[in-house]
């Protein structure tokens, strides 16, 4: 039994890191393999992650971690019984994929303005809380070409747009994702989408 693709890990910079790897053949990850991990820290202890299958030869492990700080470094040991298959390390701050924003809501009762709000996925004491920026994706269910991205580069988790920038009388969907420039993160997954019917009063044409 050998590792074909070494484990690569990403952290949510809070409490969970996800490691994925591939074996050289079909493997029952949960019965045959164990991923041991330990924070390099005077007061830490070793933990064991039981991997799950991710395709025939693929394995994935969800590592429960202490609250992350930038200096953290974890040792990783992949075992098959008594055989050490791979040894490595992982700095969560160097491989961050933020959590997805939540609670996306579209407020349509503000005079011809659409107000989209969502929740920051981190608690205020987490470093990423004040460093997230967002991308909001709005698209028409009727017209695949009516697809737009709004970049929200300020800290407030909200976006205002004029209802008239969208077509009236049709349904739209929106979703939001986050990233943090400070740690050069990847984008988060998209939030669940929310749907609304866009309608606004057309201004009277002056002749």
């Amino acid at each position: 039994m050998k590792v074909l693709q070494e484990p690569t890990c990403v952290s949510d910079y809070m409490s969970i890191s996800t490691c994925e790897w591939k074996m050289n053949g079909p493997t029952n990850c949960s019965t045959e393999l164990r991923l041991l991990y330990q924070l390099v820290f005077l007061l830490s202890e070793a933990h064991t992650c039981i991997p799950e299958n991710n395709g025939g030869a693929g394995c994935v492990c969800h590592l429960l971690m202490d609250d992350v700080v930038s200096a953290d470094n974890y040792t990783l040991d992949l075992w098959a019984g008594q055989q050490l298959l791979w040894k490595g390390s992982f700095k969560p701050s160097e491989h961050v994929k933020p959590r997805a924003p939540g609670n996306l809501t579209v407020h349509t009762n503000v005079s011809d303005t659409l107000l989209l709000t969502w929740s920051n996925p981190y608690p205020p004491d987490n470093y990423l809380y004040n460093h997230l920026t967002y991308a909001v994706n709005i698209w028409s269910e009727n017209d695949p070409a009516d697809f737009r991205i709004y970049n929200v580069t300020y800290l407030e988790p909200s976006l205002r747009i004029a209802a008239s920038t969208l077509k009236s009388g049709i349904s739209y969907r929106a979703r939001v994702r986050a990233w943090a420039q400070c740690y050069n993160t990847t984008w988060s997954e998209w939030s669940p989408s929310t749907k609304w019917h866009n309608s606004y009063r057309e201004p009277f044409e002056q002749h």
Partner: antibody, heavy 115, light 109 residues
């Protein structure tokens, strides 16, 4: 908002015992190492003890064998049992949250060891 | 045990002046594990700098940290009235644990 509130300080005779408590709120206590740091009157800061998320502990040489740090994750509480107290243990005792450094501190509780 | 020695013991300066505080370690300290704190009378310490040079959230940019190995520096570019306080450096070592310097008092001249 992160809050750390120490209690249990007071006047105790040399050789006596005292138990300090720290009530934590505003963060996930179980995922954080916790510490006690003290400061004698007019003196500098001295790290006393720390406890990891899994219960691993470490102590300064000056308190080893006399002090015991513990935690109750269900109660979001940190404790310091201090036995065989000496005059030189007189200090403000701070509860702190952190790891390699300490971003969050309580306001401290004063322990006076005197006859 | 790693010993941290801060100098000077006291620094007498006027508001608007530049303050340079030194912290010297008895053996090499990883940059990741060197921090600076400010403490005012009757208050708990406040983290200013971690990782030798990273400002903690909410700390004004007049505070900066630098250095590596055994020599570290905290610089306050222009002293404000609220900056007069005692400053401590602190290190963490995987085997020896946590130690603080003895402190530098920055007082009004």
């Amino acid at each position: 908002e992160v809050q750390l509130v120490e209690s249990g300080g007071g006047l105790v005779q040399p050789g006596g015992s005292l138990r300090l408590s720290c009530a934590a709120s505003g963060f996930t206590f179980s995922r954080n190492a916790m510490f006690w740091v003290r400061q004698a009157p007019g003196k500098g800061l001295e790290w006393v003890s720390g406890i990891g998320t899994g219960g691993a502990t470490s102590y300064a040489d000056s308190v080893k064998g006399r002090f015991t740090i513990s935690r109750d994750n269900a109660k979001n509480s940190l404790y310091l049992q201090m036995n065989s107290l000496r005059a030189e243990d007189t200090a403000v005792y701070y509860c702190a949250r952190g790891r390699y450094y300490f971003p969050w501190w309580g306001q401290g509780t004063l322990v006076t060891v005197s006859s | 045990e790693i010993v941290l020695t801060q100098s000077p013991g006291t620094l007498s300066l006027s508001p608007g002046e530049r303050a340079t505080l030194s912290c010297r370690a008895s053996q090499s300290v990883s940059n990741s594990y060197l921090a600076w704190y400010q403490q005012k009378p009757g208050q708990a310490p406040r983290l200013l700098i971690y990782g030798a040079s990273s400002r903690a959230p909410g700390i004004p940019d007049r505070f900066s940290g630098s250095g590596s190995g055994t020599d570290f520096t905290l610089t306050i570019s222009r002293l404000e009235p609220e900056d007069f306080a005692v400053y401590y450096c602190q290190q963490y070592d995987h085997s020896a644990g946590w130690t603080f310097g003895q402190g530098t008092k920055v007082e009004i001249k």
